[in-house]
């Protein structure tokens, strides 16, 4: 067992250009707040998934109005530490995620209003009882300083804090095969209590002769490293030289959470989810009230005077969540159209449009045309998001800025020779044809098919097509 | 600015159909989108059938040849059909529009949520 702690150093603009805008004014006086989330592992899970291993929620900082004209200064802070407690081991791996939460303090109808100003997140390694690290996070404009650590509650020592410490019965030495607890000198290890042979690396225990493995490990005495790959089923050792899961008994078998939370079963082990008012790995941490302000995005707290009775959370439209924490899907409706892509800001829905588009929700075709001019001659034809020229005779290209070659189609029948003109072609026809495209046969008697040939050209004369 | 006023809903054995109303009503310039989600009990919001921005309608797979959405423009208002009700659709149903106001801005607006149970 042991505690998580966080302390807040700072938060404020980060460095370079575009400074955040001051969250408060004198017209919104507010304050912030910290939340802390805690997951096992180094698994890049979604910010709604349980925080396994804890979470925690700062006092609020103090009230602050933003001073006319002046830039968005660090913003004053709530004091002490976030202290998140576990019960069991420390999985010496672990995801974080750190929000900064604002609370107005206007006139607002039914109390003041939160929102979330920034999320942070990351993975880390972390030996219990080591010193605090100190960590630089940056959410959009806004950066935020903090320092954390692991310790571990007495009796339990250790990098994991599975190891048991008591007071020396002696002044001078420890008994019979037992060793000082180091860092603390004047204590001595406490006898082995767990199952013989229990890795003490990888394995801990809460009763005498058990052995329980930390993730990614298994086996009776928890030396053997987890390795699904070549195995065919996701549940317990199956021998200690392939390391491989096969069926055995579940993790879920039990249930070991805790005040009525719900046993469901991960690749590497188990998840709990909590009834409203507990956390914590198997929901066993409480104490959680509505004076804690427990519920966010307006949410309204109801129950939870004391720390024995669980708080509800009743959500606005559009929360949901124990905590009101989690945003509903506006996005899945698809209001973004001509294939824009939909984003939820929170506190607006935004389209993201294709090219061609444009409006709030990628409603107006754009001019495909405007500001595109054809070359030449040519008229610009809109459709689908993008503009194409139509040429004029003896130009082509996407804008007719190439001169197209007019006889390349072979347009003169019946042998007839082409020649590119500046207005397009000209046709020399074969003997016995006449017409634009010598399309015509003349008749043996000099009569031809057509009506009268053109006053001034005979036929055989080149005919020029216009 | 704009309410969402739902109707229908109630108690009904496994087989059995009810119908869903939802009627938009207040500073209306269009309706963008409109549609209907739901929350079973202890889990995550999800839409279950809607008219996109694009006009096309979108059913979730759980309810697709069971449930039928329709629209009336004129009234302004969306409808749920839902036929061979199962156990696991009893939830609580919101619907829900973006809206284009009168002022041209877009918003998004839901109900204020029907309960519908299906007895085994």
């Known amino acids: 067992a042991g505690v998580f702690e966080l302390q807040i150093h700072s938060f404020g603009p980060g460095p370079g250009p575009g400074a955040p805008r001051s969250p408060c004014s004198a017209r919104l006086p507010c304050r912030l707040f910290f939340r802390v989330c805690l997951k096992p592992g180094l698994s890049e899970e979604a910010a709604e998934s349980p925080c396994a291993l804890g979470a925690a929620l700062s006092a609020r900082g103090p009230v602050y109005t933003e001073q006319p004209g002046a830039p968005a200064p660090d913003l004053p802070l709530p004091d002490g530490l976030l202290q998140v407690p576990f019960r069991d081991a420390w999985p010496g791996t672990f995801s974080f995620i750190i929000e900064t939460w604002r609370e107005e303090l206007g006139d607002q109808i039914g109390g003041p209003a939160w929102s979330l100003l920034a999320r942070v997140a990351g993975r880390r390694r972390l030996a219990a009882g080591g010193p605090w690290a100190r960590d630089i996070q940056r959410a959009g404009a806004w950066e935020l300083r903090f320092s954390y650590r692991a310790r571990c509650e007495p009796p339990a020592v250790g990098t994991a804090c599975t190891r048991l410490c008591r007071p020396r019965s002696a002044p001078s030495r420890c008994g019979p095969g037992l060793r000082p607890c180091a860092p603390l000198e004047d204590e001595c290890e406490a006898p082995l209590v767990c199952r013989a042979g229990c890795s003490p690396e990888h394995g801990f225990c809460e009763q005498p002769g058990e052995c329980r493995c930390l993730e990614g490990w298994t086996g009776p005495l928890c030396t053997v490293p987890v390795s699904t790959s070549s195995c065919l089923s996701p549940r317990g050792p199956s021998s200690a030289t392939t390391g491989c899961l096969v069926p055995g008994p579940g993790p879920c078998d039990g249930n070991p959470c805790a005040n009525g939370g719900s046993c469901s079963e991960t690749p590497r082990s188990f998840e709990c989810t909590c009834p409203r008012g507990f956390y914590g790995l198997r929901c066993e941490v409480s104490g959680v009230t509505c004076a804690d302000g427990p519920c966010f995005n307006g949410g309204l707290c109801v129950g939870g005077a004391d720390p024995d009775s669980a708080y509800i959370c009743h959500c606005p439209p559009g929360f949901q969540g124990s905590n009101c924490e989690k945003r509903v899907d506006r996005c899945s409706l698809q209001p973004c159209r001509n294939g824009g892509l939909c984003l939820d800001l929170g506190h607006a829905l935004r389209c993201r449009c294709r090219a061609g588009f444009a409006g709030p929700r990628c409603e107006h075709d754009l001019d495909d045309c405007a500001g595109r001019a054809c070359a030449n001659g040519g008229t610009c034809v809109e459709g689908g998001g993008a503009h194409r020229c139509s040429c004029a005779l003896g130009f082509g290209g996407r804008d007719c800025r190439e001169r197209a070659d007019p006889c390349a189609a072979r347009p003169c029948a019946h042998g007839g020779r082409c020649y590119a003109h500046f207005s397009g072609l000209v046709c020399a026809c074969a003997p016995g044809y006449m017409g634009a495209r010598c399309e015509f046969p003349v008749h043996p008697d000099g009569a031809s098919a057509l009506p009268a040939a053109p006053p001034g050209l005979r036929p055989g004369d080149p005919q020029r097509y216009l | 600015q704009v309410q969402l006023v739902q109707s229908g809903g109630g108690l009904v054995q496994a087989g059995g159909s009810l119908r869903l109303s939802c009627a938009a009503s207040?500073?209306?310039?269009?309706?963008?989108?409109m549609g209907w989600y739901r929350q079973p009990p202890g889990k995550q919001r999800e839409l279950v059938a809607g008219?996109?921005?694009?006009?096309?309608?979108k059913y979730a797979d759980s309810v697709k040849g069971r449930f039928t959405i329709s629209r009336d423009n004129a009234k302004n208002t969306v409808y749920l059909q839902m036929n061979s009700l199962k156990p696991e659709d009893t939830a609580v149903y919101y619907c829900?529009?973006?809206?284009?106001?009168?002022?041209?801005?877009?918003?998004?607006?839901w109900g204020q949520g029907t309960q519908v149970t299906v007895k085994p």
């Open positions: 008219f996109t921005g694009d006009g096309s309608t």
């Open positions: 207040g500073s209306i310039f269009s309706i963008n989108a």
């Open positions: 829900a529009a973006d809206v284009q106001l009168l002022n041209s801005d877009y918003e998004f607006y």
